[in-house]
Interface confidence: low
């Protein structure tokens, strides 16, 4: 997280830290006491594109709460993970839910609207481009989708598109994604924050929902927008996968 | 009971049979699992007017249900029993309430209105002037009080009153009493039915209430009306007596 | 933190016999509860009684037990939100 | 006629330990009931729980037990009433 604040109180108990092959820090989000969401890209870090979920599983290390190591049983990639940058992680044992470790809810309704504010926590790189040793969070507004597409692809018109990412890496942008950021204080997400939730507080229900999962964490206040996978598009697949496995 | 029907099913489980001194059959009504109402006149049968409750108690024999003998601990006469022809009987042990033995409720509201029908069961004399050996019952309408007073006392005007009972015995008639009978089939109560309840079924509550206790059982389809003590006038005294004893 | 008497330990698998009342009897019940941060998911009301075979059964769920499922999205110390 | 499991006999003063559920616990209760033709008169709701001293107590009535009082005016076989 570039800028933002330290999570002193443990306000993001769904936030997990995943160490990928060769020691890269990434994010994951607890969505039940035995399952987490992360990005497919996180899972494939330092693996070839042909790697299977079985190959990936033993290469991951996962921590929840205050550095509590949890064992992974299996990884399930989204069947269309090149378009929907998502994977599920199943733990060997259910975690004990406490004030430090608690899943975030998946939404039934769509909370995404331009200007709506969400909170993104993460273990990713900070303004010094170092991985943070204390969990941080930032408050980011949902962006206008067309502006985001123009920012990264020059145009919303297919034939006029070309790759214009200010950070030289292109996000996956489609109907399953939304964009958020940047704040006026130049606060943003950065490398290693992917897999974290775009958390929205439903005031009426007093409940926090993961409206999205950060997929493109390369903006780092250089590009203007982080890109997130819409959680409403995941819910059916998630529930089906959890029930089957 | 003159006419009426046999109680084949045990529909009057509050009905008790009391044998007074020298073997006369009378009625009593179970109002809790340890107390019964009867008439003061029943209690004084074959006793002098100066007899005390203590004198009367050992001379009585009491049966409930299907000839189940129960032991009497004490008798309590109404403090004004020459006007309110009532006494209470306390049993030595609580009876076990079953389908054959069950108290009737005392009413909080006044069910007595001319034409309203009640059921009177009894072990008293039948059309042959013999005591019945099977419990019988009759359905009787509440009478117009003025007609009843005229029937037994010639007039409702005090100075015009004289004793005109068709059966040569005068009932106690006052503000604590009501009259009921006769049916068009010449059905009536008779000697030995006194102490039995004028039972009214409250359809809303599906509960049977003793709206009155038969005091004057000498009509026997010769005179037109049986006379009953109003239960609403007894409730406070009954509850107080039961609590004290 | 559970209450002592709710989370009590039935060391000897027995509960003391409750006093008898005249013309009455007792029905033994257990009510399932969940620890903090969990909520009960049950087909019935979470209350179970002993049947003739001395099995704990619920009128709706039968012998099927309730579950304590993790609460989601209810952080104990939520972030201070800027209005 | 009472149901067997309502009027059951706790011969050995014990009730079998109910199954445990993950992240949950059980609260032991007894509910006082009355035999047929009696009804419960209680300061509380007739449900008693074991306190730390293993006494059966009701939250309202404390250790005071309910009573079964005779039902009145509810004959099992009422007279066939002519409408």
């Amino acid at each position: 997280i570039i800028g933002g604040s330290m999570d002193a109180k443990g306000s993001f108990p769904w936030q997990a830290k995943m160490i990928s092959r060769h020691g890269l820090t990434t994010g994951a989000t607890l969505i039940s006491d035995q399952w987490l969401l992360t990005t497919a890209k996180n899972l494939f870090l330092n693996h070839s594109e042909t790697a299977s979920a079985k190959d990936i599983t033993p290469t991951l290390t996962l921590y929840v709460g205050k550095n509590q190591l949890v064992e992974i049983e299996k990884v399930v990639l989204h069947p269309n993970h090149s378009v929907v940058d998502i994977g599920l992680i199943k733990l060997k044992q259910r975690v004990l839910v406490t004030e430090r470790v608690m899943p975030i809810c998946l939404p039934s309704k769509d909370y995404i609207a331009p200007g709506r504010v969400g909170y993104v926590s993460g273990w990713g790189r900070n303004a010094n481009f170092r991985f943070t040793d204390r969990l941080k969070y930032v408050m980011l507004p949902v962006a206008d989708q067309d502006k985001c597409v123009v920012h990264y692809e020059n145009s919303t018109v297919p034939e006029k598109k070309n790759l214009t990412s200010p950070v030289g890496v292109q996000p996956i942008l489609n109907e399953h994604t939304f964009c958020a950021g940047l704040t006026k204080y130049q606060e943003d997400t950065c490398y290693g924050d992917a897999g974290s939730a775009f958390a929205i507080h439903d005031m009426e229900e007093d409940t926090w929902y993961a409206a999205g999962i950060l997929s493109f964490d390369k903006s780092c206040a250089v590009a203007e927008y982080g890109v997130y996978v819409r959680a409403t598009d995941l819910k059916d697949w998630v529930q089906e996968t959890m029930a089957k496995n | 009971i003159i006419g009426g029907s046999m109680d084949a099913k045990g529909s009057f489980p509050w009905q008790a049979k009391m044998i007074s001194r020298h073997g006369l059959t009378t009625g009593a009504t179970l109002i809790s699992d340890q107390w019964l109402l009867t008439t003061a006149k029943n209690l004084f049968l074959n006793h002098s007017e100066t007899a005390s409750a203590k004198d009367i108690t050992p001379t009585l024999t009491l049966y409930v249900g299907k000839n189940q003998l129960v032991e009497i601990e004490k008798v309590v006469l109404h403090p004004n029993h020459s006007v309110v022809d009532i006494g209470l009987i306390k049993l030595k042990q609580r009876v076990l309430v079953t389908e054959r033995v069950m108290p009737i409720c005392l009413p909080s509201k006044d069910y007595i209105a001319p034409g309203r029908v009640g059921y009177v069961s009894g072990w008293g004399r039948n059309a042959n002037f013999r005591f019945t050996d099977r419990l019988k019952y009759v359905m009787l309408p509440v009478a117009d009080q003025d007609k009843c007073v005229v029937h037994y006392e010639n007039s409702t005007v005090p100075e015009k009153k004289n004793l005109t009972s068709p059966v040569g015995v005068q009932p106690i008639l006052n503000e604590h009493t009501f009259c009921a009978g006769l049916t068009k089939y010449q059905e009536d109560t008779c000697y030995g039915d006194a102490g039995s309840a004028f039972a009214i079924h409250d359809m809303e509550e599906d509960t049977w209430y003793a709206a009155g206790i038969l005091s004057f059982d000498k009509s026997c389809a010769v005179a037109e009306y049986g006379v009953y003590v109003r239960a609403t006038d007894l409730k406070d005294w009954v509850q107080e007596t039961m609590a004290k004893n | 933190v559970e209450l002592g008497n709710d989370a009590m330990d039935f060391e000897d698998d027995s509960c003391p016999k409750p006093p008898e009342i005249a013309n009455g009897y007792v029905e033994h019940l257990v009510r399932y509860r969940c620890r903090q941060f969990y909520r009960l998911r049950a087909e019935g009301d979470g209350v179970y009684t002993l049947n003739d075979e001395k099995q704990w059964v619920n009128t709706v769920a039968g012998e099927k037990l309730p579950e304590c499922e993790a609460v989601c999205g209810k952080p104990k110390h939520p972030v201070d939100q800027v209005q | 006629v009472e149901l067997g499991n309502d009027a059951m006999d706790f011969e050995d003063d014990s009730c079998p330990k109910p199954p445990e559920i993950a992240n949950g616990y059980v609260e032991h209760l007894v509910r006082y009931r009355c035999r047929q033709f009696y009804r419960l008169r209680a300061e509380g709701d007739g449900v008693y729980t074991l306190n730390d001293e293993k006494q059966w107590v009701n939250t309202v009535a404390g250790e005071k037990l309910p009573e079964c009082e005779a039902v009145c005016g509810k004959p099992k076989h009422p007279v066939d009433q002519v409408q």
């Epitope: 229900e205 007093d206 | - | 933190v1 209450l3 709710d6 049950a42 009301d45 209810k74 | -």
Partner: antibody, heavy 121, light 108 residues
Framework: EVHLLESGGGLVQPGGSLRLSCQAS????????MSWVRRAPGKGLEWISS????????YTADSVKGRFTISRDNSKNTLYLQMNSLRAEDTAAYYC??????????????WGQGTTVTVSS | DIQMTQSPSTLSASVGDRVTITCRAS??????LAWYQQKPGKAPKLLIY???SLESEVPSRFSGSGSGTEFTLTISSLQPDDFATYYC??????????FGQGTNLEIK
């Protein structure tokens, strides 16, 4: 604006019954737990009953259990309290309250103005 | 059941004073404690939940602290509008909800 409006209070004789209603507006009623709380004259606040967004979750104070029943009609955005066998000690101002949380165990963030119940012969 | 004991029962203070009300639980309730304010003829108003979280639109002069069995409500600088009765309340999934007996804050 979030608003709760109670009705149905009044004078009733001991042993009688009343049904209180609470009309909710300004929030998603069917996602919220709701409660009834009362305050007797000269006494403190006393919780009566709570009902979850899912009506399986109902909790009732022992002092009224068996006499009072909480219910809700989400289609009408209305909370109810059916009060039977009323006693003199049930005389109080009755408040309907919205739980902060969607579950049945949380603090109450919004309260109605209250309706008065008087039990007297 | 949990018993909540509030002290003092009555508190006399002046505008500008710093006042503290204490609430003790008969057993640990973690941070599941709320504070309410009630004025005569009015509905109670939530001030603090989860022992120390300030309800929205409640002035910052109100603060709560504590966990386990000991809790306090502090008003840093008493305003004329603050004279009322204050209640603490324990709540969590182990119902019933238990209120303190109330503290009447009156003008000295």
């Amino acid at each position: 604006e979030v608003h709760l409006l109670e009705s149905g209070g009044g004078l009733v004789q001991p042993g009688g019954s009343l049904r209180l209603s609470c009309q909710a507006s300004g929030f998603t009623f069917n996602s919220n737990a709701m409660s009834w709380v009362r305050r007797a004259p000269g006494k403190g606040l006393e919780w009566i009953s709570s009902i979850g967004a899912n009506t399986n979750y109902i909790y009732t104070a022992d002092s009224v259990k068996g006499r009072f029943t909480i219910s809700r009609d989400n289609s009408k955005n209305t909370l109810y309290l059916q009060m039977n066998s009323l006693r003199a000690e049930d005389t109080a101002a009755y408040y309907c309250a919205k739980n902060r949380d969607r579950y049945s165990y949380d603090a109450w963030s919004v309260w109605g103005q209250g309706t008065t119940v008087t039990v007297s012969s | 059941d949990i018993q909540m004991t509030q002290s003092p029962s009555t508190l006399s203070a002046s505008v500008g004073d710093r006042v503290t009300i204490t609430c003790r639980a008969s057993q640990s309730i973690d941070i599941w404690l709320a504070w309410y304010q009630q004025k005569p003829g009015k509905a109670p108003k939530l001030l603090i939940y989860e022992a120390s979280s300030l309800e929205s639109e409640v002035p910052s002069r109100f603060s709560g602290s504590g966990s386990g069995t000991e809790f306090t409500l502090t008003i840093s600088s008493l305003q004329p509008d603050d004279f009322a009765t204050y209640y603490c309340q324990a709540y969590n999934s182990n119902y019933p909800y238990a209120f303190g007996q109330g503290t009447n804050l009156e003008i000295k």
